[in-house]
Amino acid sequence: TQHGIRLPLRSGLGGAPLGLRLPRETDEEPEEPGRRGSFVEMVDNLRGKSGQGYYVEMTVGSPPQTLNILVDTGSSNFAVGAAPHPFLHRYYQRQLSSTYRDLRKGVYVPYTQGKWEGELGTDLVSIPHGPNVTVRANIAAITESDKFFINGSNWEGILGLAYAEIARPDDSLEPFFDSLVKQTHVPNLFSLQLCGAGFPLNQSEVLASVGGSMIIGGIDHSLYTGSLWYTPIRREWYYEVIIVRVEINGQDLKMDCKEYNYDKSIVDSGTTNLRLPKKVFEAAVKSIKAASSTEKFPDGFWLGEQLVCWQAGTTPWNIFPVISLYLMGEVTNQSFRITILPQQYLRPVEDVATSQDDCYKFAISQSSTGTVMGAVIMEGFYVVFDRARKRIGFAVSACHVHDEFRTAAVEGPFVTLDMEDCGYNIPQTDESTLMT
């Protein structure tokens, strides 16, 4: 977890696809009776922006207390501010809830920079613009935090949507989505459409803007174009996937594919950037620099620190390459690729220059914990977290930012051999050695 990149701590195109097609979503996804791909009440239920996270409105307790909650597929705790904090407009007041139950247990979650800690309990939870159900869920009431909440972000808690294995304090604490599926008839699947603005938003615009959709229990066909392509969830902890090839403007980075997944590759809505392992990042930046060499930018830009500004409306998108990640397909020896544009990996930043300029940060960064497909990737696609079938689907998002010359793409199939070898096996700690 790295400050400025992992929320909430802030803080390439190859040859033509083969004739053969991968299995993909038709109308076979688990759905409630009578709900075949239309979830009108859940569409547009997210707000926010990639730099500070996307949040959904939730209610907690009896009577219901409304809070905005960050949607985070990179963690597994439902945790909410439960004490006054300078950056919180409101917080969960357990003493006002008749249905709150104290678990008499603390939880402490440290990050590389920052932390939060709190007290565990359960209460009744619902999502106003979600399924019409109420569930009793575990809640971490955050009583102390450092560099966790973001000034002006407008969210007061975090909804960890990953698996129990990475829940804190341990995997016995059932995550919210597990509770939802167990206690209701909601199918074990959710999908996310994160809509990057493509231009900076000031505070009032963010509050008024639509940030996307979290469809709980299904797939909404109006949120994507083309076909959904699925990649297996390698292991149910994070939403771990396997990348088998990387291209910049169609040029293969030609690295051992294990490097792309060292030590893992995950899909994480709570991370702003596309984060790449050190060797991969260096090769990718070298290739992006070469592709955009008609203009030169300072090293601080490529480090994601400095902003580069252009006259409003003149950002030279065409000089920046597209980036393609090939993902393991559902069929042996087949992969598919997702392609993002500079409109995804150059992140608009507000309030730094004049209104006559458009300013951006480079939103690809280095990681020491593997590849993280954060908002930069997700803003190009409609992403289906099909937990029931242990797979993640990608389709071109109906709201992705593009220009008249290029668009994000999901294409396949491609023949790729020995894809299993691309996965990195994290050494298991022999716990017995810790006893000595």
Epitope: E295, K296, G300, L307, D351, A353
Partner: antibody, heavy 120, light 108 residues
């Protein structure tokens, strides 16, 4: 060592176009390590950035001057140029050309400057 | 737009004294800040870049510090040739565009 020298008329009439040349000697303007820029300083006042150019011709301008400024480059002559149209007395200043080094971030080498007065 | 405010506007000191000049940014510029020295009738000269790195040929008595919004240029012991106007400039927003208003260091 590398030197920069501004040249051009010291007097320009209001509403006309100010034209200056910066000649780079002792090194190549086509170096991929640098941008080249113009900065001005009205008498007794502070510094104002005008714009930059890369040898490929890629330009960046100060938004407040953008509608009136053109910066261009001639790599064969090792020169870059400033044109500022529709000048007024407020454009009277010492005009400096400079090299943007240290990873395209800092003006690390400057010309001596040339005073341009706008007056009829 | 990021605004750089330098203080004091004028600093009256004697040779041998320590000079402390301040530059404050209206929002964080990380460490992307430079200091320039300008003597009458001359072009500015780069003293410090990236907030604390001395440019080539700059004497050790000049030092820069700070990050985020607050920066300081310190001249440990003023020499006669140090009496000049000093400007800060941020390059967090690129291309570099914003200069401070300047601090004049004059002989007391």
């Amino acid at each position: 060592q590398l030197q920069l020298q501004e040249s051009g008329p010291g007097l320009v009439k209001p509403s006309e176009t100010l034209s200056l040349t910066c000649t780079v000697s002792g090194g190549s303007i086509s170096s991929s390590s640098y941008y080249w820029g113009w900065i001005r300083q009205p008498p007794g006042k502070g510094l104002e950035w005008i714009g930059n150019i890369y040898y490929s011709g890629s330009t960046y301008y100060n938004p407040s001057l953008r509608s009136r400024v053109t910066i261009s480059v001639d790599t064969s002559k090792n020169q870059f140029f400033l044109k500022l149209s529709s000048v007024t007395a407020a454009d009277t200043a010492v005009y400096y050309c400079a090299r943007l080094g240290h990873g395209y971030n800092y003006f690390d080498l400057w010309g001596r400057g040339t005073l341009v007065t706008v007056s009829s | 737009e990021i605004v750089l405010t330098q203080s004091p506007a004028t600093l009256s000191l004697s040779p041998g004294e320590r000079a402390t000049l301040s530059c404050r940014a209206s929002q964080s510029v990380s460490s992307y800040l430079a200091w320039f020295q300008q003597k009458p009738g001359q072009a500015p000269r780069l003293l410090i870049y990236d907030a604390s790195n001395r440019a080539t040929g700059i004497p050790a008595r000049f030092s820069g510090s700070g990050s985020g919004t607050d920066f300081t240029l310190t001249i440990s012991s003023l020499e006669p040739e140090d009496f000049a106007v000093y400007y800060c400039q941020q390059v967090y927003v690129w291309p570099p565009r914003t200069f401070g208003g300047g601090t004049k260091v004059e002989i007391k």
